[in-house]
């Protein structure tokens, strides 16, 4: 919406936001950070949810791809009045709950969580937060943490997937704007193109999947290329090579002319998938062509 880099990945994005008393005078900065970031995820297949936590976790906007609902959700977010304790685990519970429902529906969509907090979590609260973040991970989520001001980076590294999934903002809330680009770059997993996009019916091929963020997986050995054929059968293939901006994958042999394979990528061995609008189609190839 405001130009600059954008993310075209189709996944479920959860913002888990600290609205405890300590952020009372900084809620505007948190809101503008989320608003700016939200507008950069532009795939029509991307769904978003806003969750806030203090002494209780509340889903301010339940998972939706509807841009009007997202606009209204942002309006509700702007009106939040912070207060209470830092029960971060409650925020993760609310995300896990939604992931669980979506998995049960059969939508095995990849989930990305961006959790923001401003303080150190006392021992028991840290234990609960780590436990609930692990539950989100068990359900297939990738977890990022944004720490502002008095955060404990060691704690956040254990709540997030790794130290590389933590974004420290040491210069206070006004510096949140400065990390939007790096969060976008790290949290965005997108499929942009496939080469070739047309393959010969009945023949074996390798496909280069162009995109971004393929090495953001906790374990690159768990990355899969997935081909949803004619909107029914899904075939998963292990890539020969995983780089941040491309995957080299064996394409399934599609026997008939006119078959379509929609391209998806899993970062967790098929537990959930990043969707795209990239399609591979089959054509008739004569001998020697």
């Amino acid at each position: 919406e405001d130009g600059g880099p954008a993310c075209y990945g189709g996944f479920d994005l959860y913002f888990i936001l600290d609205k405890s008393g300590s952020v009372l005078h900084h809620w505007n900065e948190i809101y503008y950070f989320v608003e700016q970031l939200a507008h950069k995820f532009i795939s029509p297949q991307l769904r978003m949810s806003f969750i806030v936590f203090s002494t209780r976790g509340t889903t301010l906007m339940k998972l939706t791809e509807d841009r009007e609902q997202i606009r209204q959700g942002l309006e509700e977010l702007q009106k939040v009045l912070p207060g209470g304790d830092t029960y971060m685990h409650e925020g993760f519970e609310r995300a896990s709950e939604q992931i669980y429902y979506e998995n049960r529906q059969g939508y095995r969509t990849a989930s990305v969580i961006i959790a923001l907090t401003d303080g150190e979590l006392h021992e028991d609260l840290f234990f609960y937060s780590e436990r609930e973040a692990n539950r989100s991970r068990d359900l297939g989520a990738i977890v990022y943490c944004v720490g502002v001001k008095d955060f404990n980076e060691t704690q956040l590294a254990r709540i997030a997937d790794s130290k590389d999934h933590v974004f420290p903002v040491n210069d206070g809330f006004q510096a949140l704007q400065g990390i939007i680009h790096s969060i976008l770059k790290k949290s965005c997993i997108e499929i942009l193109a496939a080469e070739p996009s047309t393959i010969c019916a009945g023949e074996s091929f390798q496909v280069v999947v162009r995109g971004n963020g393929f090495r953001h997986a906790r374990n690159v050995d768990r990355v899969l290329c997935s081909f949803k054929i004619n909107d029914s059968v899904t075939l998963n293939e292990k890539p020969f090579s995983v780089e941040d901006t491309y995957l080299l994958c064996p394409a399934p042999i599609l026997k008939e002319v006119g078959m379509k394979a929609a391209l998806q990528v899993s970062m967790n061995d098929g537990l959930s998938f990043i969707s795209s609008s990239v399609i591979i189609t089959t054509t008739h190839c004569s001998d020697g062509s």
Epitope: R56, T58, T59, L60, K62, E90, E93, R94, S96, E97, Q98, I99, Y100, Y101, N103, R104, R131, N134, R135, D138, L139, G140, L271
Partner: antibody
């Protein structure tokens, strides 16, 4: 298909410990995200959630009964066991086990436990 | 934990629409699930995650949730829908049930 069945004593004496077993089939407790809950319902009254065990062995308990409850699982036997100490006549109820994580999609038929001397 | 409040009873004529409410502080910010329980039987999940219907549940059952009230709606109520209905939510690692509503089909 998914099935759950509760078993245990029909009658227990006050102050005794109740042990209930839930034997299930059609799903695995080693699968991410799910779990098994115990719920009870006194005659003519509402449902009351007691305890839950997750696939990763995390446990949670009803705040009001926490000190009296223990939940455990035996994944290889497809069983979940609930023990409740210091039984009282007010604990007379039908005890159900059910599958789920954040809601309960399959229930056993329940077992009536009467607490009486 | 959140408290879920239901009316003890609701009556409806056959073929009409029954609405059963479940209220709680900012309940729209959490998810609500609904169970049907007939006498002598175990509860059956009829709606989960506010408005999703499990397979095998008739289309006449629907759910909504916003503000401080979640609602189970049964359109074209049939005699077989007479039962107790419970709302349920998840809060601080606990499952919480409402007190139940007895639906009478006149």
């Amino acid at each position: 298909q998914v099935q759950l069945k509760e078993s245990g004593p029909a009658l227990v004496k006050p102050t005794q410990t109740l042990t209930l077993t839930c034997t299930f089939s059609g799903f695995s407790l080693s699968t991410s995200g799910g779990g098994v809950s115990w719920i009870r319902q006194p005659p003519g009254k509402a449902l009351e959630w007691l305890a839950h065990i997750y696939s990763n062995d995390d446990k949670s308990y009803s705040t009001s009964l926490k000190t009296r409850l223990t939940i455990s699982k035996d994944t290889s036997k497809n069983q979940v066991v609930l023990t409740m100490t210091n039984m009282d006549p007010v604990d007379t109820a039908t005890y159900y086990c059910a599958r789920g994580g954040y809601f309960l999609d399959y229930w056993g038929q329940g077992t009536l436990v009467t607490v009486s001397s | 934990d959140i408290e879920l409040t239901q009316p003890p009873s609701v009556s409806v004529a056959p073929g009409q629409t029954a609405r059963i409410s479940c209220s709680g502080d900012n309940i729209g910010g959490i998810y609500v699930h609904w169970y049907q329980q007939k006498p002598g039987q175990a509860p059956v999940l009829v709606i989960y995650a506010d408005s999703k219907r499990p397979s095998g549940i008739p289309e006449r059952f629907s759910g909504s949730n916003s503000g401080n009230t979640a609602t189970l709606t049964i359109s074209g109520t049939q005699a077989e829908d007479e039962a107790d209905y419970y709302c349920q939510s998840y809060d601080i690692t606990s499952l919480v049930f409402g007190g139940g509503t007895k639906l009478t089909v006149l």
